[in-house]
Interface confidence: low
């Protein structure tokens, strides 16, 4: 008769993937089809993998996701021409542990944080074999880093200054696949290092080749010599320049730039130690060509006396205003109405005071430091009849 060997009476497994093994001897050796595994609910599993030596057949079964309800008595069954044998064994499926609370930040500096990992209470089963503190900067596409922790209080070192981090704790119980899901996430920000950036930073185009950066006067809190470092880089080209400006000045003209190009500028106040960078500011140099026509022009919401006109404009041409020109079809050129919209970020406008049942010719064009765009064609707008009063 076949014999089932090396099968313990009790197995503790972690929920998740599980590959139980049934090993049997006998003559003839059991084949793949002759070995099965029966779950507590009566489901019969067949081997996913099978090997044999001169002495044993080994059936390897795959349960892709074993869960606590699968706990109970499983049976390894071997049925050959020489006879049938069954070996029951107990499987206890454990729930992977997960902390209920996010870790707490006790203290932070510019490059460290002291954390209480708050690993208890946790959901799921113990005992906990090990604990990991996972952390990463929020705005970086970096993988989570982790450290193994033994104490509830742990210090994270080598952090970046003025950076927001995410933290969570992962608990690991004994046995293969014992890593639980990470617990709730805590966010914190490390402290700054060095002087804060200049206040009131403002970046405006001055010409086709210059931008002007201004800031509020800086009043140092110590006797240390200081200067303002300004970094400017082109968005379109990989071109960067750093300029040192004496600390008593409140502006700098960034020159030798290219027309119609977008630049990113930031500044910091340096002493012996480097200060903290400001947020990025962006601006375009003035255009060296006429602006392109507004695009996606659409006339909608037409009534007897009004209509809405909408459009989009391209970035980078120093467009300062949009003009809508309209006149009654067939009237003289000089009888038109111009509406000048000085805020180029506005992308729609309601024409009012129109005549009912009238055809209008509408033109729209953009203006920049060079001049006005040339409308390719006019748009026709016909107002509706005036509705009769009841």
């Amino acid at each position: 008769t076949p014999k089932i060997v090396d099968l313990p009476d009790h197995i503790e497994v972690n929920s998740g993937k599980f590959n139980p093994i049934c090993k049997a001897s006998g003559w003839p050796l059991p084949t793949n089809e002759e070995m099965t595994l029966v779950k507590p609910d009566g489901t019969v599993l067949h081997p996913k993998d099978f090997n044999h030596t001169d002495h044993f057949s080994v059936a390897i079964f795959t349960i892709h996701r074993i869960l606590p309800p699968d706990s109970g008595v499983w049976v390894c069954s071997v049925n050959t021409v020489a006879g049938m044998v069954e070996k029951p064994f107990n499987i206890s499926v454990k729930v992977l542990p997960k902390p209920l609370n996010a870790p707490n930040v006790i203290d932070t500096g510019h490059n460290f944080a002291v954390i209480n990992i708050s690993s208890e209470p946790y959901f799921g089963d113990g005992p906990i074999k090990s604990k990991k503190l996972l952390y990463k900067p929020v705005n970086h596409y970096e993988a989570w880093q982790h450290i193994q922790v033994t104490n509830e209080i742990v210090t994270l070192n080598y952090l970046e200054p003025r950076t927001e981090y995410e933290l969570c704790v992962q608990l690991v119980r004994r046995g293969e696949g014992g890593e639980g899901h990470p617990g709730p996430v805590r966010r914190f920000t490390t402290a700054s290092i060095g002087l804060p950036p200049p206040r009131g930073l403002n970046l405006l185009p001055k010409s086709q080749t210059t931008l002007n950066l201004t800031w509020q006067p800086i009043f140092p809190s110590s006797e240390d010599d200081f200067y303002v470092e300004v970094e400017r880089r082109s968005v379109q080209k990989s071109d960067q320049q750093n300029i040192k400006v004496p600390g008593n000045l409140t502006s700098v003209l960034l020159n030798n730039l290219h027309p119609r190009e977008q630049y990113v500028v930031r500044a910091r106040v340096n002493t012996k130690a480097q200060g903290e960078w400001s947020e990025d500011l962006t601006a375009w140099t003035l255009s060296d060509i006429l602006p392109p026509q507004p695009e996606n022009i659409k006339i909608s919401n037409i009534t007897h006396s009004s209509a809405v006109i909408s459009w989009t404009i391209l970035d980078g041409y120093s467009i300062s205003s949009i003009t809508i020109r309209y006149k009654v079809q067939g009237k003289n050129e000089d009888q038109h109405v111009d509406v000048k919209i000085k805020n180029a970020t506005i992308t729609q406008y309601q024409l009012k005071g129109l005549e009912p049942e009238t055809a209008y010719q509408v033109d729209i064009f953009a203006e920049n430091n060079i001049g006005s765009s040339n409308p390719a064609f006019s748009h026709e707008l016909v107002t509706l009849p005036e509705s009769q009063a009841p």
């Epitope: 090396d6 313990p8 093994i21 090993k23 090997n51 030596t53 044993f56 080994v58 993988a143 004994r174 046995g175 293969e176």
Partner: antibody, heavy 115, light 107 residues
């Protein structure tokens, strides 16, 4: 048949990061863990860690957590081991091996850290 | 971490002789143990997995067994190509750990 191809040797200067490769063929690359193992001259074998190419889940031996970074390129079925700030202690043969059961091994890359 | 203590570290034997190498696990690893063979040129090949299952193409003179926490690799009749290095490897609990190795030398 299953094959793991590794370059025979790499020379790197101390402190300069190095990336070792392991190109897999003959099986579904995204279905098996890929292990990395270190062997110093005249010494035994030491497990560095493993990565699952399907989702880049990584398990590292704590001893190597600040030293090794494991990555994969699914499009070329290649696994990589990057060693940061190498020193003479990192001069060794580095093997890749397939799966939880280490059923197939690469030939190993001999890394020499020397100025 | 689970320690795998492999013995002997070196062994001199004659052609045709029967030898056994042993690995002792510091914790329960079930049958999660491989035996590996390393050639002088560094090539590593798995001989046995799950304690006793022979890899395909591995000669039948190799066998694996277990007694409690002791795991053995037995070569029933040594041939000239068997005089190389052998390692055990446990894969029951991460980090996976290797035995220190056994150098099998010809007497």
């Amino acid at each position: 048949q299953v094959q793991l191809q590794q370059p025979g040797a790499e020379l790197v200067r101390p402190g300069a990061s190095v990336k070792l490769s392991c190109k897999a063929s003959g099986y579904s690359f995204t279905s098996y863990w890929m292990n990395w193992v270190k062997q110093r001259p005249g010494q035994g074998l030491e497990w560095i860690g493993m990565i699952h190419p399907s989702d880049s889940e990584t398990r590292l031996n704590q001893k190597f957590k600040d030293k090794a970074t494991l990555t994969v390129d699914k499009s070329s079925s290649t696994a990589y081991l990057q060693l940061s700030s190498p020193t003479s202690e990192d001069s060794a043969v580095y093997y890749c091996a397939r799966g939880n059961y280490f059923d197939c091994w690469g030939q190993g890359t001999t890394l020499t850290v020397s100025s | 971490d689970i320690q795998m203590t492999q013995s002997p570290s070196s062994l001199s034997a004659s052609l045709g002789e029967r030898v056994s190498l042993t690995c002792r696990a510091s914790q329960d690893i079930g049958i999660s143990l491989n035996w590996l063979q390393q050639e002088p040129d560094g090539t590593i090949k798995r001989l046995i997995y799950a304690t006793s299952i022979l890899d395909s193409g591995v000669p039948k003179r190799f066998s694996g067994s277990r007694s409690g926490s002791d795991y053995s690799l037995t070569i029933s009749s040594l041939e000239s190509e068997d005089f190389v290095d052998y390692y055990c490897l446990q894969y029951a609990s991460s980090p996976w750990t290797f035995g220190g190795g056994t150098k099998l030398e010809i007497k």
